[in-house]
């Protein structure tokens, strides 16, 4: 069948879910496109204990995470609801800041050095961290 | 050995519809993802279409976007092309093409011979 | 959408000799550089990918160099095999996008 029932080779398995971090930069489309070619999405914090769990893989690193508001609303990629989950943006964040000269705003957000969450011009070439859940159906206890 | 057999090539009239076929055999079929890339008389390589490994997600380039659907049936070892709204200037031998499986990227590191789709009235 | 350049358009050598193939991208793809050989009624064959990495099966006379915009395909001592079209392609960025390609022709 088409069940995922254990993560891909060099992807990291954790709390039923496998991740995938990246060593290169990518604009946020193109780091989209390329979780998704994987059956995965950008990844979708929705916990503190997976805030800590992905910020300890990437480290110090400016890293895009599976959120933005280019449409105008934040929303996760994932469809997982933004203003009743998780956040952990830094003091005065996100701002939508326009004074960084290259058109726009800031539609984007990333992990910052210190694991606090920033918008960003999605343009920019940031690591970027894939994620797939494994399969609900191998999950669940087997049946007596 | 990795062999890719596409199918389905011919001649339509423009506004007509076509589906080209692509046998795969040789490798793990549902862990890869797979391409159409195509070659006009005396053009280069263009790229049309790519879907995911389970078949969750597709992209198209914008000359085809909404005209062609490309699908996968892994039961079968088979990756699809429907192309539909055909214009003359879609003529080209289309070729499928496995990606390589690196995450991060998409470049082919296997291709079929191609099926030849012409495009007149 | 990157759009790559590959010159000449033709290049005509003699077996035996080195063939430089050039590739320029319109903006930066980093090292995310394939090159293609492709021959008529044959299937694409992968020779380069990571701008300098050989694919397997690939001749030690096929090197590739280069990155950010500008790359170079070498093929240091040509064999009769080698006349074909070759292609470079970007995945950087998406649309994925492809050179126009370059003919190597027995001179």
């Known amino acids: 069948g088409s069940e995922r029932t254990c993560c891909p080779v060099n992807w990291v398995e954790h709390e039923r879910s496998c991740y995938w971090f990246s060593r290169s930069g990518k604009a946020w489309a193109d780091a989209d496109n390329y979780c998704r070619l994987e059956d995965a999405h950008l990844v979708v914090v929705t916990s503190w204990e997976e805030q800590k769990f992905v910020q300890h893989h990437i480290g110090p690193v400016n890293t895009w995470m599976g959120l933005h508001d280019q449409n105008g609303p934040w929303k996760w990629v994932d469809g997982t609801d933004y203003e009743t989950g998780f956040k952990n943006w830094r003091p005065e964040q996100p701002d939508d800041w326009y004074g960084h000269g290259l058109g726009g705003g800031e539609d984007c957000a990333h992990f910052t050095d210190d694991g606090r969450w920033n918008d960003d011009v999605c343009q920019r070439p940031y690591r970027w961290v894939c994620e797939t859940e494994l399969d609900k159906a191998s999950q669940e206890p087997p049946l007596l | 050995e990795v062999q890719l057999l596409e199918s389905g090539g011919g001649l339509v009239q423009p506004g007509g519809s076509l589906r080209l076929s692509c046998a795969a055999s040789g490798f793990t079929f549902s862990s890869y993802a797979m391409s159409w890339v195509r070659q006009a008389p005396g053009k280069g390589l263009e790229w049309v279409s790519a879907?995911?490994?389970?078949?969750?997600?597709?992209f198209y380039a914008d000359s085809v976007k909404g005209r062609f659907t490309i699908s996968r049936d892994n039961s079968k070892n088979t990756l699809y092309l429907q192309m539909n709204s055909l214009r003359a200037e879609d003529t080209a031998v289309f070729y499928c093409a496995k990606d390589h499986g690196i995450v991060g990227t998409i470049y082919f590191d296997y291709w079929g011979q191609g099926t030849l789709v012409t495009v007149s009235s | 959408e990157i759009v790559m350049t590959q010159s000449p358009a033709t290049l005509s050598v003699s077996p035996g000799e080195r063939a430089t193939l050039s590739c320029r991208a319109s903006q930066s793809v980093s090292s995310d550089l394939a090159w293609y050989q492709l021959k008529p009624g044959q299937a694409p064959r992968l020779l380069i990918y990571?701008?300098?990495a050989r694919a397997t099966g690939i001749p030690a006379r096929f090197s590739g160099s280069g990155s950010g915009t500008e790359f170079t395909l070498t093929i240091s001592s040509l064999q009769s095999e080698d006349f074909a079209f070759y292609y470079c392609?970007?995945?950087?960025?998406?649309?994925?996008?492809f050179g126009g390609g370059t003919k190597v022709e027995i001179k």
């Open positions: 879907i995911s490994g389970r078949g969750s997600s597709t």
């Open positions: 990571d701008a300098s």
């Open positions: 392609q970007q995945y950087y960025n998406w649309p994925l996008t």
